[in-house]
Amino acid sequence: AGVFELQIHSFGPGPGPGAPRSPCSARLPCRLFFRVCLKPGLSEEAAESPCALGAALSARGPVYTEQPGAPAPDLPLPDGLLQVPFRDAWPGTFSFIIETWREELGDQIGGPAWSLLARVAGRRRLAAGGPWARDIQRAGAWELRFSYRARCEPPAVGTACTRLCRPRSAPSRCGPGLRPCAPLEDECEAPLVCRAGCSPEHGFCEQPGECRCLEGWTGPLCTVPVSTSSCLSPRGPSSATTGCLVPGPGPCDGNPCANGGSCSETPRSFECTCPRGFYGLRCEVSGVTCADGPCFNGGLCVGGADPDSAYICHCPPGFQGSNCEKRVDRCSLQPCRNGGLCLDLGHALRCRCRAGFAGPRCEHDLDDCAGRACANGGTCVEGGGAHRCSCALGFGGRDCRERADPCAARPCAHGGRCYAHFSGLVCACAPGYMGARCEFPVHPDGASALPAAPPGLRPGDPQRYL
């Protein structure tokens, strides 16, 4: 176990032309915060894929207001380190994503607005216990300068935090073949050596000489990937040739839970139910009580004060797991209707609604037809967060209260004269034309072009347009 630490030194415009505009203004003051996401190995995974090694969010930085006319300077940063605890061995190779977020502090409806300013990513090799590594990454016109390191939490030591240190049994020296644990010179390295050849990336051990595999790997030395598509031969599954099984061994095969813990498969991983007095991803940590603070993310610990009594973490909304270590993104399925913005506040979901909508999930159309009357026989039509009236002939305007001039658009063709009428308009056609809008020429022999004149109407009579 250990902690990955990230120190942000500066975030501001990068060198070269095209300096970015300041993200904050006098009208919209804002402050920055950072998110780091770590994944094991040198994978080039999508930014959305899980942060399998862990993730952390910084505190909010100081409020910043742009000075008018000044170029964007290095922006004020949050205090402190970003710390990502890891429970198992440090993988040595890792991928990172660092995101810079802006929190606008103007008069926002429903709380502050967040937007992603920049995202940088990289793949690095890093030994635990080493010095701070410095880095510069650019995202568009922005530049991020930072340092990072991985350090082991006692009693773990070593480049992967897999060796354990124990207090000396004798005051003067360590036992045969055991070295002092630098920098803890008063402690000695515990004799924990995994089976020779055990994969340092995919295997681990909790007892000397063993080699236990992380999920996705199998074989005596954890060097064989399981459940890959190459396992299928034309005659069906074959484990002899490829060393893999289909269906692949489940994550609970071989029981990764230590100290008598029982394993259950979860949708994508496994979970250990630990006996009293143990906790951790694999029940590897002993003698834990509520006094040790085993519940993460604000979980409430309930249990006895002595190491033999079990504790239970009651997780706040948005977290789960035996130690409330798993975060749930409840906005993932877009619960906010009508284009509302979803905010997972931890204790609750909140929707910031677009103009024209309201309600806990933005489900209410404020401008709908409820209680809206269209005058003079008009009918109300809903749509897009607004309502409109479809007006009866002779009326117009938002609520059909205005008398429309049906002749305004000059509807009578070929010089016909237009007369407003209570049910619409009437065209008095010029000689030689007929039809509701005087659109049909009259032939010399008295026959008209299609359509035929209605009975009782002579060419040249006024035509009522309904």
Epitope: E45, A46, E48, S49, P50, C51, A52, G216, S227, T228, S229, P247, G248, G250, S264, E265, T266, P267, R268, S269, E271, C315, Q320, G321, K326, R327, V328, D329, R330, S332, L333
Partner: antibody
Framework: QITLKESGPTLVKPTQTLTLTCTFS??????????VGWIRQPPGKALEWLAH???????RYSPSLKSRLTITKDTSKNQVVLTMTNMDPVDTATYYC????????????????WGQGTLVTVSS | DIQMTQSPSSLSASVGDRVTITCSAS?????MYWYQQKPGKAPKLLIY???NLASGVPSRFSGSGSGTDFTLTISSLQPEDFATYYC?????????FGQGTKLEIK
Amino acid sequence: QITLKESGPTLVKPTQTLTLTCTFSGFSLSTSGMGVGWIRQPPGKALEWLAHIWWDDVKRYSPSLKSRLTITKDTSKNQVVLTMTNMDPVDTATYYCARIVSFDNDVVSAMDYWGQGTLVTVSS
Amino acid sequence: DIQMTQSPSSLSASVGDRVTITCSASSSHSYMYWYQQKPGKAPKLLIYLTSNLASGVPSRFSGSGSGTDFTLTISSLQPEDFATYYCQQWRSNPFTFGQGTKLEIK
């Protein structure tokens, strides 16, 4: 628009192997967070989860049927295939495939879109 | 295995009634999922992550609960709500469903 459709034989004989294909559109199994699962429902009975597969090829099987089930995906064809060996009349059911979404490492957000289902009868 | 027990197994109610269906799990878990199924049709997601309404589901449906006891509530029954309702847990394999609650017109 997201759709899923199950296809396969409607009648199989006891001891035979059933192969069902789920063809989907509107999402991709190369996208992080996406999965496809199989669920069945014997006539007049409750739903039973069988298996699922994730974008990164992590698979899960119902323990009581694990020895008989295999789930695979063909990302380029937008298909997931479930094979079930040694069929028995008690396996007669409507078989559904459904999209599963997980935006967190180990928490299912939802099984939000389902196919119409295909009725498979096991009889000699 | 986590057993999911729904109650009641069947229920008669009238349009406009407030209806509550409960689902009890044999061991504690974090989230519940609810589905509605009509005869001859595929199940439809109603509630995910215990209390979140799926897209297109009317706001008269709501979900609540934690630990082992979870509830689906329909605030005012509509004719189209008469169907069978299932709960499901995604905590531990096998990912089990409840036996169903059939909601019928009184």
